[in-house]
Interface confidence: low
């Protein structure tokens, strides 16, 4: 007769993990005892367990609670034993040695590999600003054994990094994704991957981009010079800019004090029906946390009793 | 025999700062991942951070993000945690706890200290 | 963030009981679930690992089971040191989270 066997059992840690030890006896050829034993190398012999024909299951006390025999029906040729939650130190070899009668004793070896799945963490690089060069957007880490695979699925452009640390029983990969910051960016995902074989799908972490920003200021209004006239109402300016954090809006008059009736709401100056006295020289100041903008408009207020039109000027500075 | 001790709690105004220890014994303190889990007066654990022995890499509970800072010395086989701004719900028993030796798979957590009260109070 | 669901959040039984209580997650977590007990005053202690092991040192009447999303923590006959609060814990993913705890009492 001969032992079945496998060379490797693969398991995903946490699961039951099957030795299988199958006698193919000729017939009439019975099994007396399997034992089981951990056999790595440099380490003594380390009994599992131990299936007797007569007096059935016997565990050592080391993996009391750990080992058992498959579900019913059973072969009595069949001496299989189930490791039941493995773990990572459970990795190794095992042999099982089968006394049999009357051909005597065999024995067999395989190797037991746990999968430890890996637990990913995102950590997000320093904050992202509009003008800085290549910068740490992200990095993430994954360990597990084998070796779990970091990559990463974004529409960003960008460089990515990988390193490994080997540790006795696992390894621990850390990827980083660098880029160089834009607006566009803006709520774009980054989103990390790792990849395993004890996973049943990918392991994804996202982090949504944030990169801080002023535009440039302009502002609207004095398109058609000519509806800027005494008697005019609802006359308006309104500053354009966008930014991340949104920026706030303050308005000033160069030339003096903002005139009396004139409303500012946010990024809009609101004016009172038209006199000569709210021509002057306007300033738009936007600002965030990252920077500021200004833009200045000339007013100039028209009398329809006089011909000569007048000009504005447009000027917008940072 | 492992031993966890944490040091450093006590009464700090909101807004102020505490550093808290944990000195680490009985065990091989390089080889393991640490955790700060804490508790409020009354209620359930809840998870603060965790430093792997993998350089040092950290992970934080959002709402302590940017306010606490983990470290670990392990020539001194010593575990920190530097809190800033502390709130009035920063207020419990912070224990540190050693992430299980031979289950690098996860984080369970096998052996705690006795914990340290940090009240924050004005 | 995983949420961990334990029910009940409290029971009242007596000595030799059969205790069990209950652990929900709200995504499948495989077995990377933890029991921990904790007596007034003290630190808590690690009962149960990988859903289903017990720890070194820990009662045989203690035990574990489930996988995925639901899992159960039993005391098959409870006795007078028993009495504390339990908590579940999922670390398949970080952050790590508890339950809210169940909260054994005398009868």
């Known amino acids: 007769g001969e032992l079945e066997t496998s060379d490797v059992v693969t398991v995903v840690l946490g699961q039951d993990a099957k030795l299988p030890c199958f006698y193919r006896g000729d017939s009439g050829e019975q099994v007396g005892q399997v034992a089981w034993a951990r056999v790595d190398a440099g380490e003594g012999a380390q009994e599992l367990a131990l299936l007797h024909s007569k007096y059935g299951l016997h565990v050592s006390p080391a993996y009391e609670g750990r080992v058992e025999q498959p579900p019913p029906p059973r072969n009595p040729l069949d001496g299989s034993v189930l490791l039941r939650n493995a773990v990572q130190a459970d990795e190794g070899e095992y042999e099982c040695r089968v006394s049999t009668f009357p051909a005597g004793s065999f024995q067999a070896r395989l190797r037991l590999r746990v999968l430890v799945p890996p637990l990913p963490s995102l950590n997000p690089g320093p904050a992202l600003e509009e003008g800085q060069g290549l910068t740490l957007a992200a990095s993430c880490t994954a360990e597990g054994s084998p070796a779990p695979s970091v990559t990463w699925d974004t529409e960003v452009k960008g460089t990515t990094s990988s390193r490994s640390f080997k540790h006795s029983r696992s390894a621990a990969v850390t990827s980083e994704f660098h880029l160089v910051p834009s607006r566009s960016m803006n709520g774009q995902p980054l989103t990390c991957v790792v990849s395993h074989p004890g996973l049943l799908q990918d392991q994804r972490i996202t982090h949504i981009l944030h990169v801080s920003f002023l535009a440039e200021a302009s502002v609207r209004g004095l398109e058609d010079q000519n509806l800027w006239h005494i008697g005019r109402e609802g006359a308006m300016l309104k500053c354009l800019s966008e930014g991340q954090p949104p920026p706030s809006y303050n308005w000033t008059r160069l030339d003096g004090p903002l005139p009396s009736g004139v409303r500012v709401d946010g990024d809009t100056l609101g004016f009172p029906p038209l006199t000569t006295e709210h021509s002057g020289i306007y300033v738009c100041h936007v600002s965030n946390e990252f920077s500021s903008r200004d833009s200045q408009v000339t007013v100039d207020v028209l009398d329809p009793q006089e011909d000569s039109g007048k000009q504005v000027d447009l000027v917008s500075a940072s | 025999e492992v031993q966890l001790v944490e040091s450093g709690g006590g009464l700090v105004q909101p807004g102020g700062s505490l550093r808290l220890s944990c000195a680490a014994s009985g065990f091989s303190f390089t080889n393991n991942a640490m955790s700060w889990v804490r508790q409020a007066p009354g209620k359930g654990l809840e998870w603060v951070s965790r430093i792997d022995t993998i350089g040092g890499t950290s992970s934080y509970a959002d709402s302590v993000k940017g306010r606490f800072t983990i470290s670990r010395d392990n020539s001194k086989n010593t575990l920190y945690l530097q809190m800033n701004s502390l709130r009035a719900e920063d207020t419990a028993v912070y224990y540190c706890?050693?992430?299980?030796?031979?289950?690098?798979?996860?984080?369970?957590?096998?052996?705690w200290g006795q914990g340290t009260l940090v009240t924050v109070s004005s | 963030d995983i949420q961990m669901t334990q029910s009940p959040s409290s029971l009242s039984a007596s000595v030799g009981d059969r205790v069990t209580i209950t652990c929900r997650a709200s995504q499948g977590i495989s077995s990377y679930l933890a029991w921990y007990q904790q007596k007034p005053g003290k630190a808590p202690k690690l009962l149960i690992y990988?859903?289903?092991s017990l720890q070194s040192g820990v009662p045989s009447r203690f035990s574990g089971s489930g996988s995925g999303t639901d899992f159960t923590l039993t005391i098959s006959s409870l006795q007078p040191e028993d009495f504390a609060t339990y908590y579940c814990q999922q670390h398949y993913t970080t952050p790590p989270t508890f339950g809210q705890g169940t909260k054994v009492e005398i009868k």
């Open positions: 706890a050693r992430q299980t030796e031979d289950r690098s798979y996860g984080y369970d957590l096998d052996y």
């Open positions: 990988a859903a289903s």
